[in-house]
């Protein structure tokens, strides 16, 4: 039971940090206007990985993407791959991990195979929230460094007299999304990992007993796993899911509204 | 578009509240400027007014003597003046706030006059 | 606040003559974001409400003749009227819409000779 919850709430949680990945991967505050210290413009200047907007005081947003590749800094380049990446495997996780969920039944699918699906699917977790938190400190710390150097000369003479504002950016919402998703998503998968380790069949041979029932022979294994007709002749412990005695973990094991959550 | 309410001739010390009818467009998806005219000479903004939340944006000089409010069901902005004295003697325009920050529609101006 | 200095204070000139008029701020208004200028010119004529003639520095407002050219960046702008018309008699006043407070410029007085 405790596997079958930790799987669950570690898909879950994955499943809420990708999602917060994908979200933080479409904002377009990224980074903002700074505010702070700074003469109080009409303007409202913010930045995302694909576009740029200006939102004015009069309550008009426009927004302009980058319609340029090889015009881009290589820095927003790459966080834009971290995410992508980020994105793509935590997908590919999700799918993975459907299958790999010990609520759903799918044919005959051993739990070996689960706790493969499980642990790959977990890894794929731990990975792209990994990358969600690289885009993220990437883009971060290239604000860090453009701020400081936008401080140092935050007033450009013009001509002696006129003086020009720097635009200085900070920290956008979509940092503190994608910060916080992507650490969700590496939880997501360090859990799905540890499922993976109570999902794992041991390879013990366990002694058949048989009881003789008039009409049929059927035997039953300690265990309580249903073996097939016959003697001996499932000696691994594997799950036949065709009714017969369950254990603690398949409580659930004909199909119900439970079963495809 | 922007109709405003007629002149006003009022003594020291009083208060007085001017009007300004929009039409033609929705009302509450601008904000709503006001401008202030002194003996025809240079314009001075005052501040301005989000009809949709009801924010408010004043300029330190008319904090405390301005003051806006809307009715939305009417699609009119309002602007109390209060304590008046000779310096308030002026031309007021209401102007609907637009794209590039400017102040595109104007009112015909309410001309307030103070004197005892 | 902003300063906005217009020059000439006042203008005489003929019909069809061409005429530009000078704007210029405290601090630079070009906005980093979208490299636009934002610097908005006004036309007042007698007894009437100023009207929007061009916005962002040269961006005219539909409706607004052609003889009318806004340009400038940063902190220099001019109004450039390509060809005098009597109905052009008015006050120009261009406008920070930049900084808080907006502040308009003392204006420059157009008259016909």
């Known amino acids: 039971m405790a596997v079958t919850a930790c799987q669950g709430l570690g898909f879950v949680v994955s499943l809420i940090g990708i999602a917060g990945i994908i979200a933080a991967t479409c904002m377009d505050q990224w980074s903002t206007q700074d505010l702070y210290n700074n003469p109080v413009t009409a303007v409202f200047n913010y930045q995302g990985l694909w576009r740029s907007c200006v939102r004015e005081s009069s309550g008009f947003t426009e927004c302009r993407g980058y319609f340029t590749l090889l015009g881009l800094p290589a820095m927003l380049q790459a966080v834009r791959a971290l995410m992508i990446v980020g994105i793509v495997l935590g997908a590919i996780g999700l799918l993975v991990s459907i299958f790999a969920l010990k609520c759903i039944r799918i044919g005959s699918m051993e739990d070996s195979a689960k706790a493969n699906m499980t642990l790959t699917s977990g890894i794929m977790f731990i990975v792209s929230g990994l990358c969600a938190i690289a885009g993220v400190s990437v883009f971060a710390n290239m604000l860090v460094t453009n701020f400081w150097m936008s401080t140092a000369n935050m007033y450009t003479g013009m001509g002696g007299m006129v003086q020009t504002v720097q635009t200085r950016y900070t920290f956008g919402a979509a940092l503190f999304v994608g910060w916080v998703a992507g650490g969700l998503t590496l939880i997501g998968g360090v859990m799905m990992c540890i499922a993976c380790r109570g999902l794992a069949p041991e390879e013990t041979n366990y002694k058949a007993v048989s009881y003789h029932a008039s009409g049929h022979s059927v035997a039953y294994k300690p265990g309580g796993f249903k073996a097939s007709t016959g003697f001996g002749s499932n000696t691994k412990n594997k799950k036949i899911y065709d009714g017969g005695a369950r254990t603690e973990d398949e409580v659930q094991s004909y199909p119900s509204k439970h079963d495809y959550v | 578009q922007l109709q405003q309410s007629g002149p006003e001739l009022e003594k020291p010390g009083a208060s007085v509240k001017i009007s300004c009818k929009a039409s033609g467009y929705s009302f509450t998806g601008y904000k709503m400027n006001w401008v202030k005219q002194s003996n025809g000479e240079s314009l001075e903004w005052i501040g301005n007014i989000d009809p949709y939340y009801g924010d408010t944006t004043y300029t330190q000089k008319f904090k405390g003597k301005a003051t806006f409010t809307v009715d939305t069901s009417s699609s009119t902005a309002y602007m109390q003046l209060k304590s008046l004295t000779s310096e308030d003697s002026a031309v007021y325009f209401c102007?609907?706030?637009?794209?590039?920050?400017?102040?595109?529609?104007w009112g015909q101006g309410t001309s307030v006059t103070v004197s005892s | 606040d902003i300063v906005m200095t217009q020059s000439p204070s006042s203008l005489t000139v003929t019909a069809g003559e061409k005429v530009t008029l000078s704007c210029k701020s405290s601090q630079s208004l070009l906005n980093s974001g979208n490299q636009k200028n934002y610097l908005t010119w006004y036309q007042q004529r007698p007894g009437q409400p100023p009207k929007l003639l061009i916005y962002?520095?040269?961006t005219r407002e539909s409706g607004v003749p052609v003889r009318f050219t806004g340009s400038g960046s940063g902190a220099d702008f001019t109004l450039t009227i390509s060809s005098v018309q009597a109905e052009d008699l008015a006050v120009y006043f261009c406008q920070n819409a930049y900084f808080y407070p907006l502040t308009f410029g003392t204006g420059t007085k157009l008259e016909l000779r």
């Open positions: 962002w520095a040269s």
């Open positions: 102007a609907r706030y637009n794209r590039g920050n400017t102040m595109d529609y």
